[in-house]
């Protein structure tokens, strides 16, 4: 295991005033999976609701790199390759757990955080609101 | 904070043989996430590549319930509401972190685990392989 020198400004797990603290083993199961979605499939380019992948990097967070999808168009690509605005490209979102360093820069002290990420886009029929 | 009595069978953060271990404050940010759009969109029904949500339940994991998307059709729904097999419904996958108690039942020791989940489906143009 890696031993990290104690930073006196970082919290001590024995400290009674520190909020409920647990130990988390970061030797992740299933670690060798591909984290770059561009490498694992080209659906982002072939979809009728294509998206771009933006790298969201934060060294104070684990994982430090998260890929965020942004739909390329408001509409969807039709059979002719044109954007059809009678349909909508929308992001599919997923809530994920991440760890955030807290206090910042402390190598072995984190806080759990839930964040919402856009994973990709799908093409949906719009909801039509009829004026009464 | 809450002090948890030490179970002699549970790992010690000072143990050099224990894999890279960090302290995590469990007072989660964004704990009350019920207002997040993850819960409120009906894209799974309105998509041209609609999907069903299947429950993946594991009481020894957090989150205990994860919803897995399964595309309803091989093809995509066209403007007439029929399945068009010239296009393909495919799952969009995302790697997420989950927490697992390790060793089991130790109240303040967890392991991070990465799992791959299908979040929804998108409609893609098929890859055509030409026979030489």
């Amino acid at each position: 295991g890696i031993t990290i020198p104690r930073n006196p400004g970082c919290p001590n797990s024995e400290d009674k005033n520190f909020p409920r603290t647990v130990m988390v083993n970061l030797n992740i199961h299933n670690r060798n999976t591909n984290t770059n979605p561009k490498r694992s499939s080209d659906y982002y380019n072939r979809s009728t609701s294509p998206w771009n992948l933006h790298r969201n990097e934060d060294p104070e967070r684990y994982p430090s790199v998260i890929w965020e999808a942004q739909c390329r168009h408001l509409g969807c690509i039709n059979a002719d390759g044109n954007v059809d605005y009678h349909m909508n490209s929308v992001p599919i979102q997923q809530e994920i757990l991440v760890l955030r360093r807290e206090p910042p820069h402390c190598p072995n002290s984190f806080r759990l955080e839930k964040i919402l990420v856009s994973v990709g886009c799908t093409c949906v029929t719009p909801i039509v609101h009829h004026v009464q | 904070g809450i002090t948890i009595p030490r179970n002699p069978g549970c790992p010690n953060s000072e143990d050099k043989n224990f894999p890279r271990t960090v302290m995590v404050n469990l007072n989660i940010h964004n704990r009350n996430t019920n207002t997040n759009p993850k819960r409120s969109s009906d894209y799974y029904n309105r998509s041209t590549s609609p999907w069903n949500l299947h429950r993946n339940e594991d009481p020894e994991r957090y989150p205990s319930v994860i919803w897995e998307a399964q595309c309803r059709h091989l093809g995509c729904i066209n403007a007439d509401g029929n399945v068009d097999y010239h296009m393909n419904s495919v799952p969009i996958q995302q790697e997420i972190l989950v927490l697992r108690r390790e060793p089991p039942h130790c109240p303040n020791s967890f392991r991070l685990e990465k799992i791959l989940v299908s979040v929804g489906c998108t409609c893609v143009t098929p890859i055509v392989h030409h026979v030489q």
């Epitope: 409920r20 | 207002t35 409120s40």
Partner: antibody
């Protein structure tokens, strides 16, 4: 099979507090939440709040914020709901339920709390 | 809070009848809707989760449908043990329940 066993009926005076317990038998709490739901006589169901014992995370309905405290003791697999500043309209059956954060799939048998002077 | 409105508030039916109960949410809740059955003096019992999924051990005569704001619980052929009060519940936001529908013997 998960079973939630609640403490017995209570009679309380207005202004006092009540603490109801809910013990999970047939296993530990696991990673689920425990929610508390109440039902006044002849009325519908009302969610009060929840706790995830693994983490100590709590979430309270706005209506009960400041008056309800939900805790859990993992060593005994018991969750507690304490309601303070009791009034007559708090007379109800209080249920604990295992909560996946999507649905309540196992319920305790209920605890009747009567508030009367 | 999301309001859940059930209708009817009570229904009289006979054994073998098809019974339909509806539930409307004050805003879109996707499919995060559950149905419970409660008998007098007993705790509620989960019947349907995620709008249409049958909880294990629940008879197949119970079915759920709907998405967004409008949902339905159907009992295809009412049995003597089905006379009870039924509640819908949303979990798109902090959980809220409908006011209940009592299924009585005609």
């Amino acid at each position: 099979q998960v079973q939630l066993v609640q403490s017995g009926a209570e009679v309380k005076k207005p202004g006092s507090s009540v603490k109801v317990s809910c013990k999970a038998s047939g296993g530990t709490f696991s990673s689920y939440a425990i929610s508390w739901v109440r039902q006044a006589p002849g009325q519908g169901l009302e969610w009060m709040g929840s706790i995830i014992p693994w983490f100590g995370w709590t979430n309270y309905a706005q209506k009960f914020q400041g008056r309800v405290t939900i805790t859990a003791d993992e060593s005994t697999s018991t969750a507690y709901m304490e309601l303070s500043s009791l009034r007559s309209e708090d007379t109800a059956v209080y249920y604990c339920a295992r909560d996946s954060e999507y649905y309540f799939d196992h319920w305790g048998q209920g605890t009747l709390v009567t508030v009367s002077s | 809070d999301i309001q859940m409105t059930q209708s009817p508030s009570s229904v009289s039916a006979s054994v073998g009848d098809r019974v339909t109960i509806t539930c409307r949410a004050s805003q879109g809740i996707s499919n995060w809707l559950n149905w419970y059955q409660q008998k007098p003096g007993k705790a509620p019992k989960l019947l349907i989760y995620a709008a249409s999924s049958l909880q294990s051990g629940v008879p197949s005569r119970f079915s759920g449908s709907g998405s967004g704001t409008d949902f339905t619980l159907t009992i295809s052929s009412l049995q003597p043990e089905d006379f009870a009060t039924y509640y819908c519940q949303q979990y798109s936001d902090d959980p809220t329940f409908g006011q209940g529908t009592k299924v009585e013997i005609k």
